[in-house]
């Protein structure tokens, strides 16, 4: 069963050029987390494996930053990375978690 | 339950459009998944397509991107598949498949038809 | 395209044996490779997700593991309804591409 709940920054707002800490938290479970993956509509940002460590995808590279902890940061915003942000959070035994953030990059 | 279910005519003609339509039941495909074409050849290789998000937005496959549109009926929960131009190389079997978006996976897959390009 | 090269193309086993199939992709997909068993007439049916994931209900005698290129899947002893055909897939980005299968038959 399930008992675990995902707490994330919500809906957050940043300066175009500046940078952004994308935050989530799994909360209220024992479960292991064995992975975490960071995506952006049907794009894999980035994965934290619990045995292999951090992978930033390469066309994000660049802007894209582990961290803290499960978290990521992004910087060099542009007004193109407006949008919805996924936490997946698998996790062992209890499943897949998921928490969404909306980010608005401002001019 | 999810199911997926293929349609279509089985028999196309060389040059003509291949058209083929996936029902779907207990998921709505405005929900956050994407909706896939993947075609096995008679060899059984496997190739994917294309999909269509929740949120209409379409990826296709560069080695068809000149023919293949991948459109949806939200009112009957349906998905399609428009493949111009067809030749006998574009015959096989047909799926339709369900992509977590944040999942990366086929979790759910219809049972194929069988479709066949010859005058 | 990443192309994904699975071997065996075939193999002759006997119930209780230990089988092991490869794939090797031809760029780093950290552990983004998911397998799939096929039997005949069937749609192919999901086992192992994100390299070493097992499916919900998939039983743990199916294994998978490798990150970068190099995959294995592995079924530690084979049951008399496992002869099928098994397709590694790589879901780290689209196009998304398959192996070309590993046809496992009784010996």
């Known amino acids: 069963m399930m008992t675990g709940t995902i707490e994330t920054t919500g809906n957050i707002s940043a300066e175009k050029g500046g940078s952004i800490i994308l935050q989530c938290h799994l909360s209220s479970t024992t479960a292991q987390v064995t992975q975490v993956n960071w995506e952006q509509q049907d794009q894999l940002l980035a994965i934290c494996n619990a045995d292999l460590g951090w992978h930033i995808s390469p066309s994000f590279k660049d802007r894209v930053a582990p961290g803290p902890g499960l978290g990521l940061t992004l910087q060099s915003l542009t007004v193109n990375d407006t949008g919805e942000y996924f936490c997946i959070y698998h996790t062992y035994p209890d499943g897949t978690y998921t928490g969404r953030i909306f980010l608005e990059v401002l001019e | 339950q999810v199911q997926l279910q293929e349609s279509g005519p089985g028999l196309v003609k060389p040059s003509q459009t291949l058209s083929l339509t996936c029902t779907v039941t207990?998921?709505?495909?405005?929900?956050?998944?994407?909706w896939n074409w993947i075609r096995q050849f008679p060899g059984k290789k496997l190739e994917w397509m294309g999909y269509i998000t929740y949120s209409g937005r379409t990826t296709y496959n560069p080695s068809l991107k000149s023919r293949i549109t991948i459109s949806r009926d939200t009112s009957k929960n349906q998905f399609s598949l428009k493949l111009s131009s067809v030749t006998a190389a574009d015959t096989a079997t047909y799926y339709c498949?369900?992509?977590?978006?944040?999942?990366?996976?086929?979790?759910?897959w219809g049972q194929g038809t069988l479709l066949t390009v010859s005058s | 395209d990443i192309v994904m090269t699975q071997s065996p193309s075939s193999m002759s086993t006997s119930v209780g044996d230990r089988v092991t199939i490869t794939c090797r992709a031809s760029?780093?997909?950290?552990?983004?490779v998911a397998w799939y068993q096929q039997k005949p007439g069937k749609s192919p049916k999901l086992l192992i997700y994100?390299?070493?994931f097992r499916y919900t209900g998939v039983p743990d005698r199916f294994s998978g593991s490798g990150s970068g290129t190099d995959f294995t899947f592995t079924i530690s002893s084979v049951q008399a309804e496992d002869f099928a055909t098994y397709y590694c897939?790589?879901?780290?980005?689209?196009?998304?591409?398959f192996g070309a299968g590993t046809k496992l038959e009784l010996k």
């Open positions: 760029q780093d997909v950290f552990n983004q």
């Open positions: 994100s390299a070493s």
């Open positions: 498949a369900r992509w977590g978006l944040l999942r990366r996976y086929f979790d759910y």
């Open positions: 207990g998921s709505s495909i405005t929900s956050d998944y994407a």
């Open positions: 897939q790589q879901h780290y980005s689209t196009p998304l591409t």
